[in-house]
Amino acid sequence: QRFAQAQQQLPLESLGWDVAELQLNHTGPQQDPRLYWQGGPALGRSFLHGPELDKGQLRIHRDGIYMVHIQVTLAICSSTTASRHHPTTLAVGICSPASRSISLLRLSFHQGCTIASQRLTPLARGDTLCTNLTGTLLPSRNTDETFFGVQWVRP
Amino acid sequence: QRFAQAQQQLPLESLGWDVAELQLNHTGPQQDPRLYWQGGPALGRSFLHGPELDKGQLRIHRDGIYMVHIQVTLAICSSTTASRHHPTTLAVGICSPASRSISLLRLSFHQGCTIASQRLTPLARGDTLCTNLTGTLLPSRNTDETFFGVQWVRP
Amino acid sequence: QRFAQAQQQLPLESLGWDVAELQLNHTGPQQDPRLYWQGGPALGRSFLHGPELDKGQLRIHRDGIYMVHIQVTLAICSSTTASRHHPTTLAVGICSPASRSISLLRLSFHQGCTIASQRLTPLARGDTLCTNLTGTLLPSRNTDETFFGVQWVRP
């Protein structure tokens, strides 16, 4: 019985299973397109098991292939607003280290008020993910409308 | 060899890997915004391995962090229809037990006819997930257009 | 220590964890609605661990339940373009063997320029997945805008 319990821990400890789900804290100042995230049980249903936050940006702690997902809903938005303020674009990418900087996922809002997507991507320990929202509209901070997360899938 | 096979069962039996993918059965009466789901190999490609259906709503059987995903396509829909019938909104949440009631995921259709999203969230044994579609438009029952699922990710 | 390392390999070798993330290579000729994919580290962040490509289509090598995800962004697109060229539709399905042919996931662009979705589905060794884009608009080949992937979830 004790042996089985020991095995049960293996995937979590040895294999990883790093996972994080974040909620929006705030947007940066006008010339900083990044969204700043927060996570932790005290904040609701957000959490970090492995990855960490560095000044509101998500930093990876374990090499592997990750499923990255995001949903962003614009505040006070209608299809008219969205098209009037076009282009509003969201991009998720590795922003540091600079040598690994790359855009991983990009979507425009066009006449919609929400974007949601996901993708598999290799990430390395120390990679910091940034989510850039360009345009003049601000995102909703409702935790069921705007969130960002990663899930370790395999080495 | 037998030992290796025993280990191979551990993640499924001990660790979980509960998973379900459901197809739409029907919508509720006018004052019930819930979508009613069904699943099982006899119905096509839907299935339940761990979670169960309780009067068309998905009930969780194992504590853990889950990836919840959904796609809903409106029937007889064009961007004109969608905007004329706005707001049409889909929300996925824990609807019982009442003490844990919360909206997990929310999207509006605006000028689109399909919404699709996913998120990581902690769920507990006994949590029942409801998917509420508010508005006058009905969802397509095509199994490749409307579906709802959960995947256990880690304890 | 060697024992723990041996266990660590089990999920990868014995249990699967097949995974692939592909980028768009090209579209087919006018009467072929299929998108042709490519993957491998030399191409950027795409990869195949288990599944293989067969003339640009993804072939599954291990039975199991998979998470299938896709994002397609139309090139040179605005909400006006998208609605003028409507209907533009993306469908992901099993296209061979013919006996298992079925549509798994379908979305229309309506007034949007990007679709993104995901679903859980059982797939069998030898299943080939095709992604059909119908309409006159072409997809973007930017690797952060158009991608397609699968992740083995459980037997």
Partner: antibody, heavy 119, light 107 residues
């Protein structure tokens, strides 16, 4: 510490032009946008627009296009507001303002420049 | 544009009083609401941002609440140095707009 120091009061005749300066210190000038806010005598605050100090691109609110121009001298860490063809109704205190961490939240303000337009 | 309606336009209170100012937006502003204090001849000073977050160095007697279109600013115990005009500002979309101000005086 972070400071925004504006030029002194101006008395101008209708039809003339005026250029108000806002000198920034204590931070990297090109990292933060500069906003302009107008306050007519005894009135409320009106956001006029902002200038991207990295690209130089200005954004004007409705009612502040044409006669109002935002500009920069990045080497001097200074932003400018120029108003041409002055009218009596342009009489106001003009403030420059800057955000810190949060979008559209103004933590730092210049002391204000009173522009009086009178014949 | 989003209109911000502040009330009252002026009010008189005694030292130690609880003072409340309201701000109503013409549409939902998703809690992107800030409050500023302005003393005569001075620049505005940020007190509260994002509806209820207290700016660094601002005394805890100042607070904010609200959601949707309706927001409230409160001084729990009025002090002589609080005599000023207070402005709300929506920060959800351009153009940014302010309330017309509430002038606070001591009785």
């Amino acid at each position: 510490q972070i400071q925004l120091v504006q030029s002194g009061s101006e008395l101008k005749k209708p039809g003339a032009s005026v250029k108000v300066s806002c000198k920034a210190s204590g931070y990297t000038f090109t990292n933060y946008g500069m906003n302009w806010v107008r306050q007519a005598p005894g009135q409320g605050l009106e956001w006029m627009g902002w200038i991207n100090t990295y690209t130089g691109e200005p954004t004007y609110a409705d009612g502040f296009t044409g006669r109002f121009v935002f500009s920069l001298d990045t080497s001097a860490s200074t932003a400018y507001l120029q108003i041409s063809s002055l009218k009596a109704e342009d009489t106001a205190v003009y403030f420059c303002a800057r955000e810190e961490d949060y979008r559209y939240v103004f933590n730092y303000w210049g002391q204000g420049t009173l522009v009086t337009v009178s014949s | 544009d989003i209109q911000m309606t502040q009330s009252p336009s002026s009010l008189s209170a005694s030292v130690g009083d609880r003072v409340t100012i309201t701000c109503q937006a013409s549409q939902d502003i998703s809690n992107y609401l800030n409050w500023y204090q302005q003393k005569p001849g001075k620049a505005p000073k940020l007190l509260i941002y994002d509806t209820s977050r207290l700016h660094a160095g601002v005394p805890s007697r100042f607070s904010g609440s609200g959601s949707g279109t309706d927001y409230t600013f409160t001084i729990s115990s009025l002090q002589p140095e609080d005599i000023a005009t207070y402005f709300c500002q929506q920060g959800v979309t351009l153009p940014l707009t302010f309330g017309q101000g509430t002038k606070l005086e001591i009785k």
